[in-house]
Interface confidence: low
């Protein structure tokens, strides 16, 4: 069985000027899956982005997240790029930034 | 049964462009990116480039004002550019599938094609 | 960039023996970007052991991997004679994504 993840990108504030952007997927199945950030449609170099764990969710399916360090006012610049069991997906930044606690 | 084969010229003249394609059998390049790697003679591997699924591509900086990697999933096949080739540029020139949740690793490789550069 | 150095260059066994192969990073690298490979005399590279310690299937558990940060290990526990080869460790963390210059596995 194949089930496609859901993805959401997220933004939270770490510090002045600069934002976390992080993509999580959830809900899928089986368990591989590719996520990656791109810059202007390049992918970002992997030293600067941070990975979660693949992670069961409970419910027979899995979920994961990445992030990565970006300057505020750039978002646009920014997509989330997914493979997963022969799908793919790119996901822009919304720019809206949440107060959350970083990964970082 | 995944299979990958290369195929172009043999051998290319100096400061002339190396082009390969690599037609693939097994998957669908619209499900799997690919790779270029290449092997000098006696020597060890060197990663040239990738396309993703969505045709965007990662590029080795030391090839990169000079390599164009293409896909066209019609024919299920993708494409390696090497411009301005010089006697360095001779090698084992393989493609490679990247396998889908292996962390960008090569999961199934072509047989490779030897492509002398020699005037 | 990322300089992968493998040790021994050339390791001289016997069918039945324990090989360790290494691989050593010239900075740290995350451990699900490290792979190793297989490459005999003619043939392509295959791939053996993706993100560190998962072994591809088909592959015999006589193969295994591990390390972390910069240091990085292959062992092949009980050496058949196929298993004589060059094996390369692969590095994607950091762009260039670079191999290292190989280990020799040749018989005794």
């Known amino acids: 069985r194949t089930v496609p993840p859901m993805v959401n990108v997220t933004c939270s504030e770490v510090s002045e000027g600069n934002i976390t952007v992080t993509c999580r997927a959830s809900s899928f199945y089986p368990r591989n899956i590719t996520l990656t950030w791109r810059q202007d449609g390049v992918s970002l170099s992997h030293n600067t982005q941070q990975w979660g764990d693949v992670l069961p969710d409970g419910n027979g399916t899995y979920q994961t997240w990445v992030a990565t360090r970006i300057r505020q006012g750039e978002e646009q610049r920014f997509t989330c790029y997914m493979e997963h069991s022969g799908n793919h997906g790119t996901h822009p930044v919304s720019g809206k930034v949440l107060v959350l606690q970083s990964h970082w | 049964q995944v299979q990958l084969q290369e195929s172009g010229p043999g051998l290319v003249k100096p400061s002339e462009t190396l082009s390969l394609t690599c037609t693939v059998s097994?998957?669908?390049?619209?499900?799997?990116?690919g790779h270029w790697i290449r092997q000098p003679p006696g020597k060890g591997l060197e990663w040239i480039g990738m396309?993703?699924?969505?045709?965007?591509?990662d590029y080795n900086a030391a090839f990169i004002s000079r390599v164009t990697i293409s896909v066209d999933t019609s024919k299920n096949q993708f494409s390696l550019k090497l411009s301005s080739v010089t006697a360095a540029d001779t090698a084992v020139y393989y493609c490679?599938?990247?396998?889908?949740?292996?962390?960008?690793?090569?999961?199934?490789w072509g047989q490779g094609t030897l492509v002398t550069v020699s005037s | 960039e990322i300089v992968l150095t493998q040790s021994p260059g050339t390791l001289s066994l016997s069918p039945g023996e324990r090989a360790t192969l290494s691989c050593t990073a010239s900075?740290?690298?995350?451990?699900?970007?490290l792979h190793w490979y297989q490459q005999k005399p003619g043939q392509a590279p295959r791939l053996l052991i993706y993100s560190t310690s998962n072994l591809i299937s088909g592959i015999p558990d006589r193969f295994s991997g591990s390390g972390s940060g910069t240091d990085f290990t292959l062992t092949i526990s009980r050496l058949e004679p196929e298993d004589f080869a060059v094996y390369y460790c692969?590095?994607?963390?950091?762009?260039?994504?670079?191999f290292g210059q190989g280990t020799k596995l040749e018989i005794k």
């Open positions: 097994g998957f669908s390049l619209t499900t799997y990116g």
């Open positions: 490679a599938r990247k396998g889908h949740g292996y962390y960008y690793a090569m999961d199934y």
């Open positions: 900075s740290s690298v995350s451990s699900s970007y």
């Open positions: 692969h590095q994607y963390h950091r762009s260039p994504f670079t």
């Open positions: 396309i993703w699924t969505d045709g965007w591509t």
